[in-house]
């Protein structure tokens, strides 16, 4: 069971300091941006991180949403990352959900975050280069010190 708590607005970056944004095709991508670029590209660079109470404490349970015309929420259904047009629900009556991730700091580094899927144990949000694009993907990872699964989250509230 997950029960919604508060939400915050955040900018998410990979460890190469590229900014996560949602492009015109609703794809989550990373790109080099100055602070003014980041502001100019809002709301596509501003993510709503909603925290949830978890009936089985496993870290901070969150959803990641973005509000452009409508609110879309990050999903890892079938291990594929996509934004689905939906509001983060107030309650989820299950111990796993394709839209819930566990946000945890990397040990010894409070500013570096990992996001593990609640649906797929050992699968993490990651940044992966595909041709010329830096994509947000779900990655099965047993190399937990891999920088590709670490992010910084800067609160904008």
């Amino acid at each position: 069971y997950f029960g919604k708590l508060e939400s915050k607005l955040s900018v998410i970056r990979n460890l190469n300091d590229q900014v996560l944004f949602i492009d015109q095709g609703n794809r989550p991508l990373f790109e080099d941006m100055t602070d003014s670029d980041c502001r100019d590209n809002a709301p596509r660079t501003i993510f709503i991180i909603s925290m949830y109470k978890d009936s089985q404490p496993r870290g901070m349970a969150v959803t990641i949403s973005v509000k452009c015309e409508k609110i879309s929420t990050l999903s890892c259904e079938n291990k594929i990352i996509s934004f689905k047009e939906m509001n983060p629900p107030d309650n989820i009556k299950d111990t796993k959900s394709d839209i819930i991730f566990f946000q945890r700091s990397v040990p010894g580094h409070d500013n570096k975050m990992q996001f593990e899927s609640s649906s797929y144990e050992g699968y993490f949000l990651a940044c992966e280069k595909e041709r010329d694009l830096f994509k947000l993907i779900l990655k099965k990872e047993d190399e937990l010190g891999d920088r590709s699964i670490m992010f910084t989250v800067q609160n904008e509230d």
């Epitope: 496993r58 870290g59 040990p107 047993d142 010190g145």
Partner: antibody
Framework: QVQLVQSGAEVKKPGASVKVSCKVS????????FHWVRRRPGKGLEWMGR????????KYAERFKDRVTMTEDTSTDTAYMELSSLRSEDTAVYYC???????????????????WGQGTLVTVSS | DIQMTQSPSSVSASVGDRVTITCLAS??????LTWYQQKPGKAPKLLIY???KLQDGVPSRFSGSGSGTDYTLTISSLQPEDFATYYC?????????FGQGTKLEIK
């Protein structure tokens, strides 16, 4: 309780290949990997590589990558490690081990080698 | 590759002694460090994971500490069954690397 049972000792000639098996008995959850580690006489533990039974993807240590092949048969819950072009320096005890997530009180994941096979002595001698 | 420098390579001690073994990583390994004990003719046995978390069934005289690049295994009061070889292992990045081992012998 998971147990790993390895195949028996082998004596091989230089240039030959050896294939060591590792059978899982007992209940094992999904989301684990098989790793192979060896210990040569008078030396320390040395990581050789790992295989993911879910998709058969492998990662090998650089010094073994041209000679080692790790495979897994999910129907029999058995992992295999084949080492080719054997030389006398490959004389060692070879271990299989499972690599699984353990979690701390906040749910943070840590991978550990928890269950180990009994070891297989491979002797390379002419 | 991440190098793990373990010291000392051997130590002689008596029952009841306090023993400390250290491992120094060549880069930050984020506490993704485990400690193993190995006795002759036996497979390694997990003692500590996550640098400081005691594996179930391991006596509380064993403890681990450290972060970043520096890690320590301490045995607070040596028992006869503790004489063995101890290894650290970094699990942060592939290739996984062990320390060279510390042989703990009876004085």
């Amino acid at each position: 309780q998971v147990q790993l049972v390895q195949s028996g000792a082998e004596v091989k000639k230089p240039g030959a290949s050896v294939k060591v098996s590792c059978k899982v008995s007992g209940e094992i959850s999904t989301g684990y990997y098989f790793h192979w580690v060896r210990r040569r006489p008078g030396k320390g533990l040395e990581w050789m590589g790992r295989i993911d039974p879910e998709d058969d993807s492998t990662k090998y240590a650089e010094r073994f990558k041209d000679r080692v092949t790790m495979t897994e048969d999910t129907s029999t819950d058995t992992a295999y490690m084949e080492l080719s072009s054997l030389r006398s320096e490959d004389t060692a005890v070879y271990y299989c081990t499972t690599w699984r997530i353990y979690r701390d009180s906040s749910g943070r994941p840590f991978y550990v080698m928890d269950a180990w096979g009994q070891g297989t002595l491979v002797t390379v001698s002419s | 590759d991440i190098q793990m420098t373990q010291s000392p390579s051997s130590v002689s001690a008596s029952v009841g002694d306090r023993v400390t073994i250290t491992c120094l990583a060549s880069e930050d390994i984020y506490t993704y460090l485990t400690w193993y004990q190995q006795k002759p003719g036996k497979a390694p046995k997990l003692l500590i994971y996550g640098a400081n978390k005691l594996q179930d069934g391991v006596p509380s005289r064993f403890s681990g500490s450290g972060s970043g690049t520096d890690y320590t295994l301490t045995i607070s009061s040596l028992q006869p069954e503790d004489f063995a070889t101890y290894y650290c292992l970094q699990g942060s990045k592939f290739p996984l690397t062990f320390g060279q081992g510390t042989k703990l012998e009876i004085k």
